[in-house]
């Protein structure tokens, strides 16, 4: 099984090392999740030709996957730490239903898919500790998420492959933007 950050053999061998700061821990956690996404994308791309052929095919989708915009304050121009942090946490909470959808979508990387999901939950907890304005964070409605999940799973095989590909691509982009923004905080 993939080893979560902070639990590798080097950590055990070096007990006198300085403990990670909150920011370092978050940074490491995101990079760990990004590694997991890379592995999942590799399986998706090997299994179907989604990665090359369909870049534009259904790019105009209505999945409404979380995405950074100028108004979110996460880009260098107009950077706003508090607004951005709220966007990152809200976005990750919205991604959770899509990460649930990814479970059972992988054969050889089943554990990796679970690791990405669980590590994202941990990342959300880290970030919530860092946020001052928790009231501004809206949590998705569980009933709506349950309906969404059912509908996603009812699609035909080709559309499910496409959905998997788009979720992984969007989640990777969202995490990369988050990582860049968090390094400015």
């Amino acid at each position: 099984a993939p080893v979560p950050p902070g639990e590798d053999s080097k950590d055990v061998a070096a007990p006198h090392r300085q403990p990670l700061t909150s920011s370092e821990r978050i940074d490491k956690q995101i990079r760990y999740i990004l590694d997991g996404i890379s592995a999942l994308r590799k399986e998706t791309c090997n299994k179907s030709n989604m990665c090359e052929s369909s870049k534009e095919a259904l790019a105009e989708n209505n999945l409404n996957l979380p995405k950074m915009a100028e108004k979110d304050g996460c880009f260098q121009s107009g950077f706003n730490e508090e607004t951005c942090l709220v966007k990152i946490i809200t976005g990750l909470l919205e991604f959770e239903v899509y990460l649930e959808y990814l479970q059972n979508r992988f054969e050889s990387s089943e554990e990796q898919a679970r690791a990405v999901q669980m590590s994202t939950k941990v990342l959300i907890q880290f970030l919530q500790k860092k946020a001052k304005n928790l009231d501004a964070i809206t949590t998705p409605d569980p009933t709506t998420n349950a309906s969404l999940l059912t509908k996603l799973q009812a699609q035909n095989q080709w559309l499910q492959d496409m959905t998997t590909h788009l979720i992984l691509r969007s989640f990777k982009e969202f995490l990369q933007s988050s990582l860049r923004a968090l390094r400015q905080m």
Epitope: N64, L148, K151, L152
Partner: nanobody, 125 residues
């Protein structure tokens, strides 16, 4: 139960314009809700024309109508419009309004749960 009623079809000459309306009643909107227009010419399959996401307002068109057709909405009236300009004989078809609460891909017909009866558009040369 959502009901869709189209209007605005008719006979028009090449280069002319028409505005189709689709009035929805009983709608429940999620952020994946979309309303679209499809068309079916005699002896052909029903094909996607244009669609609009209800919450975000983002729109999508099939290549053959880009720059000529515009899909828009009136939230207060629960109505979606299809403004069709520079009409061509190949636009002749029955135009159907469709809606779905969970439309993930605008062009995929079976993701729309509700359909109107259709309105005939005939473009004469």
């Amino acid at each position: 139960q959502v009901q869709l009623v189209e209007s605005g079809g008719g006979l028009v000459q090449t280069g002319g314009s028409l505005r189709l309306s689709c009035a929805a009643s009983g709608s429940t909107f999620s952020k994946h809700h979309a309303t679209g227009w499809f068309r079916q010419a005699p002896g052909k399959e029903r094909e996607f024309v244009a669609a609009l996401n209800w919450s975000g307002g983002n729109t999508y068109y099939t290549d053959s109508v880009k720059g000529r057709f515009t899909i828009s909405r009136d939230n207060a009236q629960n109505t979606v419009y299809l403004q069709m300009n520079s009409l061509k004989p190949e636009d002749t078809a029955v135009y159907y309004c469709a809606a779905g609460s969970y439309v993930f891909y605008f062009t995929v017909r079976d993701q729309y749960d509700y359909w109107g009866q259709g309105t005939q558009v005939t473009v004469s040369s």
